[in-house]
């Protein structure tokens, strides 16, 4: 394990809480599912469903679990070693350049264009010009036909977990 996830909010926690399991760091770092104590002598387990860490680390706090927003469904819960995986609800998608919210998929393509790609949790429907086959980008003008979009199947995590 050597990659890092995108930083999440820190989970405020009492590092000496009695219910948290302790172990010794290995070579000065703590394993996934743990964080390091302030004196560097202990690894303290993250709290299931509250916080997590995905890699060997010297975090003083585990990372706070993401809560799925309204308009999202939870595909998998937060564990001590993996963040929550959230996905946009059917008929909505999350763009790379605006990952903070799910946007409604278009219901159809502009005049002179045909649909070649369905609405998925991470992309809008895809439209191409009938003649040239070039993709349409930007806002939709008048809609010629209404096409029911089908949701995609693969999961789209709220934040990458390496």
């Amino acid at each position: 394990e050597s990659a890092l996830i995108t930083q999440q909010d820190l989970a405020p926690q009492q590092r000496a809480a009695p219910q948290q399991k302790r172990s010794s760091p290995s070579e000065g770092l703590c394993p996934p599912g743990h964080h390091i104590s302030e004196d560097g002598r202990d690894c303290i387990s993250c709290k299931y469903g509250q916080d997590y860490s995905t890699h060997w680390n010297d975090l003083l706090f585990c990372l706070r679990c993401t809560r799925c927003d309204s308009g999202e469904v939870e595909l998998s819960p937060c564990t001590t070693t993996r963040n929550t995986v959230c996905q946009c609800e059917e008929g909505t998608f999350r763009e790379e350049d605006s990952p903070e919210m799910c946007r409604k998929c278009r219901t159809g393509c502009p005049r002179g264009m045909v649909k070649v790609g369905d609405c998925t949790p991470w992309s809008d429907i895809e439209c191409v010009h009938k003649e040239s086959g070039t993709k349409h980008s930007g806002e939709v003008p008048a809609v010629e036909e209404t096409v029911t979009s089908s949701p995609g199947t693969p999961a789209s995590p709220c934040s990458l977990s390496g």
Partner: antibody, heavy 119, light 106 residues
Framework: EVQLVESGGGLVQPGGSLRLSCAAS????????MSWVRQAPGKGLEWVAT????????YYPDSVKGRFTISRDNAKNTLYLQMNSLRAEDTAVYYC????????????WGQGTLVTVSS | DIQMTQSPSSLSASVGDRVTITCKAS??????VAWYQQKPGKAPKLLIY???TRHTGVPSRFSGSGSGTDFTLTISSLQPEDFATYYC????????FGQGTKVEIK
């Protein structure tokens, strides 16, 4: 006296590779977690990579993940940073740094070595 | 990432002046903050860790305070060798630094 001396910097083209070294002395190198930190010209400091004392565990920020690899040779008291697929934004002075005892942060730094990525 | 916002970005002061530099974390980092001094072409030097603990050999005119999100580095009586750039750093979650404060001669 703790000493960290970096070497291996230079001019490299975008997409190219470079390997930095850091020779450590004055302390028991194999007992310490080590890191690389960089400083772009006129900019602030940015953490780049961390490796455990024995070299078994490493971690990186997303900005370099998959392109940079930190490693160490405890027999030679040397820390390395292998940098691949270099970009213009990787231009910086690269410092090797030691994590202190019981403080979980860097206590000693090297003088740095300049890496310039340009065509 | 946790952002560390340092202010001011630069300041002019005279020998003997009391200088205060502040750093604000974008979220609670407890007391996991360090302060470094850097002179041109030199390695950064650790001054303060755990927000208020002076590193070995650091003069007593340097002091740190704060917890949570607000932190301060104070130089009680500026000396000629103190003209440098100062950085705060949080180490609660990975490592992020402030943009630096350059202390110049007035």
């Amino acid at each position: 006296e703790v000493q960290l001396v970096e070497s291996g910097g230079g001019l490299v083209q975008p997409g190219g590779s470079l390997r930095l070294s850091c020779a450590a002395s004055g302390f028991t190198f194999s007992s310490y977690v080590m890191s690389w930190v960089r400083q772009a010209p006129g900019k602030g400091l940015e953490w780049v990579a961390t490796i455990s004392s024995g070299g078994s565990y490493t971690y990186y920020p997303d900005s370099v993940k998959g392109r940079f690899t930190i490693s160490r040779d405890n027999a030679k008291n040397t820390l390395y940073l292998q940098m691949n697929s270099l970009r213009a934004e990787d231009t910086a002075v690269y410092y090797c740094a030691r994590r202190g005892d019981s403080m979980i942060t860097t206590d000693y730094w090297g003088q740095g070595t300049l890496v310039t990525v340009s065509s | 990432d946790i952002q560390m916002t340092q202010s001011p970005s630069s300041l002019s002061a005279s020998v003997g002046d009391r200088v205060t530099i502040t750093c604000k974390a974008s979220q609670d980092v407890g007391t996991a903050v360090a302060w470094y001094q850097q002179k041109p072409g030199k390695a950064p030097k650790l001054l303060i860790y755990w927000a208020s603990t002076r590193h070995t050999g650091v003069p007593s005119r340097f002091s740190g305070s704060g917890s949570g999100t607000d932190f301060t580095l104070t130089i009680s009586s500026l000396q000629p060798e103190d003209f440098a750039t100062y950085y705060c750093q949080q180490y609660s979650s990975y490592r992020t630094f402030g943009q630096g404060t350059k202390v110049e001669i007035k």
